[in-house]
């Protein structure tokens, strides 16, 4: 658990010609407020989709009235930080949307009116607990300067806020693999992560990144049961016991591999890795020369002119083993980036790229937004090989050219007035009525 914090430093006209003087006027004083929306991962920044990591709304800034003839200043901002609490792990990569809203304080009937001045969106990598990151974003003629950070709430620590620091009475008694938490010397930090994939039921670790097995289990991730046999005995010292685990006759017991071969268990049986000059299921076939053609799959045989000298197989790409008998699954190395599909064609690897990506390993991200424009303050968002527009409130359609009026359906009952708002619509009720839709 933790908090994402956003500090707005300035909002005002950007550099260059055509910059607006001010969003407010002498006739219509106004004040600003901000909304931030966070989503995990490098997702599309559509404001309409849920802010899965959270959202926050700032307080209203000071009232500003434009002074005729005065140079355009940075606009007065609300006090304080925008804080977005997150309950689970901090994802490390996230998308944000920051909206700047104007609240006009003129003589509107039914109260103030809101309108979206600017929306900026971006994708960032950020470790929790790090320093403030500074950013400048431009939206049309406006420029927004801000800083942000993610911090963990105690007892969580770490770059993802997934490790727990617990109060300790004796800081020097932190156990193996633990260290005191900075800056509080009376806490111990516990790394909570064993080796990835380590069995939750049958594994444990003493140091981060390792996987050791409980009784009766084996394998690098403790997922392979050791053969069991009951050792109940009707008499003698073990009669008081309820039974125990002893390794049963495993397939590699007594080493079935001849001629110095090494045995490894497989889910169904065993496999022998034979030294050079021997082959067969149990390495029992010997005296092989290059004349016997021991190299499979087009391997090139070198040496081994007589049975006493060893031969060497030089394997073609895609094969390995002392006799080139094993196919290499080159796709297991996941060479295709950005979600590309790997195809091992034997002679070559192919990557079938997702829309929006190209290159032999799908390493090039095509700019879907190049040359595209979104109308009415919309922001172009890459993704899926096609551009799409994240529209400002009140607009919709592929390029944000269509009007979308949430008040068109006249949702406010009993003569209430409807106003478009960043989170939907707001009803200003006639005297004597109340409720979100003036229904009471």
């Amino acid at each position: 658990a933790g908090v994402f914090e956003l500090q707005i430093h300035s909002f005002g006209p950007g550099p260059g010609p055509g910059a607006p003087r001010s969003p407010c006027s002498a006739r219509l004083p106004c004040r600003l407020f901000f909304r931030v929306c966070l989503k995990p991962g490098l997702s599309e920044e559509a404001a309409e989709s849920p802010c899965a990591l959270g959202a926050a709304l700032s307080a209203r800034g000071p009232v500003y009235t434009e002074q005729p003839g005065a140079p355009a200043p940075d606009l007065p901002l609300p006090d304080g930080l925008l804080q977005v609490p997150f309950r689970d792990a901090w994802p490390g990569t996230f998308s944000f949307i920051i909206e700047t809203w104007r609240e006009e304080l003129g003589d509107q009937i039914g109260g103030p009116a809101w309108s979206l001045l600017a929306r900026v969106a971006g994708r960032r990598r950020l470790a929790a607990g790090g320093p403030w990151a500074r950013d400048i974003q431009r939206a049309g003629a406006w420029e927004l300067r801000f800083s942000y950070r993610a911090r963990c709430e105690p007892p969580a620590v770490g770059t993802a806020c997934t490790r727990l620091c617990r109060p300790r009475s004796a800081p020097s008694r932190c156990g193996p693999g633990l260290r005191p938490c900075a800056p509080l010397e009376d806490e111990c930090e516990a790394p909570l992560v064993c080796r990835a994939g380590c069995s939750p039921e049958h594994g444990f670790c003493e140091q981060p990144g390792e996987c050791r097995c409980l009784e009766g289990w084996t394998g690098p991730l403790c997922t392979v049961p050791v053969s069991t046999s009951s050792c109940l005995s009707p008499r003698g010292p073990s009669s008081a016991t309820t039974g125990c685990l002893v390794p049963g006759p495993g397939p590699c017991d007594g080493n079935p591999c001849a001629n110095g071969g090494s045995c490894s268990e497989t889910p169904r049986s065993f496999e022998c890795t034979c030294p050079r000059g021997f082959y067969g299921l149990r390495c029992e076939v010997s005296g092989v020369t290059c004349a016997d053609g021991p190299c499979f799959n087009g391997g090139l045989c070198v040496g081994g002119a007589d049975p006493d000298s060893a031969y060497i197989c030089h394997c073609p790409p895609g094969f390995q083993g002392s006799n080139c008998e094993k196919r290499v699954d080159r796709c297991s190395l996941q060479p295709c980036r950005n979600g590309g599909l790997c195809l091992d064609l034997g002679h070559a690897l192919r990557c079938r790229c997702r829309a929006g990506f190209a290159g032999p390993r799908c390493e090039h991200d095509l700019d879907d937004c190049a040359g595209r424009a979104c109308a009415n303050g919309g922001t172009c968002v890459e993704g899926g090989g096609a551009h799409r527009c994240s529209c400002a409130l009140g607009f919709g359609g592929r390029d944000c050219r269509e009007r979308a009026d949430p008040c068109a359906a006249r949702p406010c009952a009993h003569g209430g007035r409807c106003y478009a708002h960043f989170s939907g619509l707001v009803c200003a009720c006639a005297p004597g009525y109340m409720g979100a839709r003036c229904e009471f």
Epitope: R166, G177, L178, V193, C194, C198, P200, F204, L214
Partner: nanobody
Framework: QVHLVESGGGLVQAGGSLRLSCAAS????????MRWYRQAPGKARELVSL???????YYADSVRGRFTISKDNAKNTLYLQMNSLKPEDTAMYYC?????????????????WGQGTQVTVSS
């Protein structure tokens, strides 16, 4: 605050038995697994035995077949039954716990430690 208190140590002849207990209190989160460690003078602390939330156990090679770890969840107490004791079992024995919000992964290194109880095995 988590409190782990060991008891049951003492002086015993080689071949004898002892039963160590560890009373646990004050857990904020789930008590996912409990361990016994030991440390002989001038040596590194070593893991003796472990029991996880579902009852799975681990024993160091040097004690397997002689020591038995168990726990009583109702009493929040961990035990180590030590039989056929040898002089090389002489050490300070520590109880340690790993607690987390959910016991959803493998047992990670301990988060909490007791003060220890001395076991001395004479020949």
């Amino acid at each position: 605050q988590v409190h782990l208190v060991e008891s049951g140590g003492g002086l015993v002849q080689a071949g004898g038995s002892l039963r160590l207990s560890c009373a646990a209190s004050g857990f904020t989160y789930s008590n996912c697994c409990m361990r016994w460690y030991r440390q002989a003078p001038g040596k590194a602390r070593e893991l003796v035995s472990l029991i996880n939330s579902s009852g799975g156990t681990y024993y160091a090679d040097s004690v397997r077949g002689r020591f038995t770890i168990s726990k009583d969840n109702a009493k929040n107490t961990l035990y180590l039954q030590m039989n056929s004791l040898k002089p090389e079992d002489t050490a300070m024995y520590y109880c340690a716990a790993y607690q987390a919000k959910y016991c959803s992964g493998p047992c990670a290194p301990p988060t909490d430690w007791g003060q220890g109880t001395q076991v001395t095995v004479s020949s």
